[in-house]
Amino acid sequence: YSHWPSCCPSKGYPSEELLRWSTVPVPPLKPASLDFHSVSCRASEDGPLNSRAISPWRYELDRDLNRLPQDLYHARCLCPHCVSLQTGSHMDPRGNSELLYHNQTVFYRRPCHGKKGNHKGYCLERRLYRVSLACVCVRPRVMG
Amino acid sequence: YSHWPSCCPSKGYPSEELLRWSTVPVPPLKPASLDFHSVSCRASEDGPLNSRAISPWRYELDRDLNRLPQDLYHARCLCPHCVSLQTGSHMDPRGNSELLYHNQTVFYRRPCHGKKGNHKGYCLERRLYRVSLACVCVRPRVMG
């Protein structure tokens, strides 16, 4: 990462917002299958990608209002093995359903302290945060 | 998204950094298969998840030094259909290899202007940015 100039809150420019929420009026895409009323280990022939996959998964919400993004979604596999392409329901032990992980850049809001140690607004702290993105049908590892 | 209090750069607290790059000393995980010298439509029995998948993919780097994160990776499917679990090479036309997309929160750096219109450092602008995360083996949609 190249270094960006440091920057910290101030009451000096109240008309300016560092974080311009107004630039994205739409909420982040909520995964279509967040309602788990009919969650099962089968591959559908319609619906969103995660329900048509032969390694189907559901999404679980991860919310922290002091983090950007505030809402993240973690994938959770519905089957240990891959579902048969033919039937869409029977599992095939030759394939494993494995989580795909990603270290996502997030920012945590924390108190900023002035020279006298008093609370002076908000600062952001960059972190890497591990998120499971999807379940993938893979061939099992063959140990050499 | 809930609203965070506005905050903008100031020279008032030079010892504080709003964006603490130092908090993440390690670079983001580079996908292991970024070198494409032997990329082909087959599912390996070892290596990273994207090469063992029966919907294998490679990663393409998307770098923008005025964006956070500066490096993003886009998945690119290596096969139109899923690879057979049995052979790891022959394609099975009953399954499609489809890209999984995600609208990721990113931040663009732009000049901040003070009350008098002069350049006062950098502000961040939040945007949603479409990224392809992986390729998933799915059952084709059956049109009703």
Epitope: R63, R110, P111 | S2
Partner: antibody, heavy 121, light 108 residues
């Protein structure tokens, strides 16, 4: 000024369903970022978080009680509800509703006075 | 699930004495919150984000710590400080608010 007040049956029998209401004023659950939790405390013991509901109806539950607990809200009436099915003596406690403060980075800033729930046959 | 262990469970201090109580987490947490509770009353938020005093909390209180280990300190014990103090942490996934078992502070 923010106030929260819990109300409930006081006493109920084992295997019955406990229904609690949290009536609040001084804030709105339609405000982005706002959320209310239910927390309980058996007499002389510690605090146990039960469930949380946000302005956008996102709901979260303590995994140890998830199968028995339901949280809901009526935004227009400034009320949050809690249901616990199949109660037994382990559910005897003072039940609090609490508002998650935003300026205080997620601590529970405002609490109700609590309502005592007893389970007895 | 992260478990918070507070120690000591009960302690007594003389007026004017320095008091320190601890809260240890079974796995690392970002921030800790502390609450004060007196008998027959709901808890009150006392310290947020590890070291920030809630409005109205006397300056003799302080909070510190990181990772697995956090503490609440009273620089000079006063009579009104006798109460039970709970630490609390939050994890966003799986979503959970966890409280410690409490430290009961009495006047010696």
């Amino acid at each position: 000024q923010v106030t929260l007040k819990e109300s409930g049956p006081g006493i109920l029998q084992p295997s019955q369903t406990l229904s609690l209401t949290c009536s609040f004023s001084g804030f709105s659950l339609s405000t982005s970022g706002m959320g209310v939790s239910w927390i309980r405390q058996p007499s002389g013991k510690g605090l146990e978080w039960l469930a949380h509901i946000y302005w956008d109806d996102a709901k979260f539950y303590n995994p140890s009680l998830k199968s028995r607990v339901t949280i809901s809200k009526d935004t227009s009436r400034n009320q949050v509800f809690l249901r616990i099915t199949s109660v037994d003596t382990a559910d005897i406690a003072t039940y609090y509703c609490a508002r998650r403060g935003y300026d205080n980075y997620g601590g529970f800033v405002d609490w109700g006075q609590g309502t005592l729930v007893t389970v007895s046959s | 699930e992260n478990v918070l262990i507070q120690s000591p469970a009960i302690m007594s201090a003389s007026l004017g004495e320095k008091v320190t109580m601890s809260c240890r987490a079974s796995s690392s947490v970002n921030y800790m919150y502390w609450y004060q509770q007196k008998s027959d009353a709901p808890p009150k938020l006392w310290i947020y984000y590890t070291s920030n005093l809630a409005p109205g909390v006397p300056g003799r209180f302080s909070g510190s710590g990181s990772g697995n280990s956090y503490s609440l300190t009273i620089s000079s014990m006063e009579g009104e400080d006798a109460a039970t103090y709970y630490c609390q942490q939050f994890t966003s996934y799986p979503y959970m608010y966890t409280f410690g078992g409490g430290t009961k502070l009495e006047i010696k």
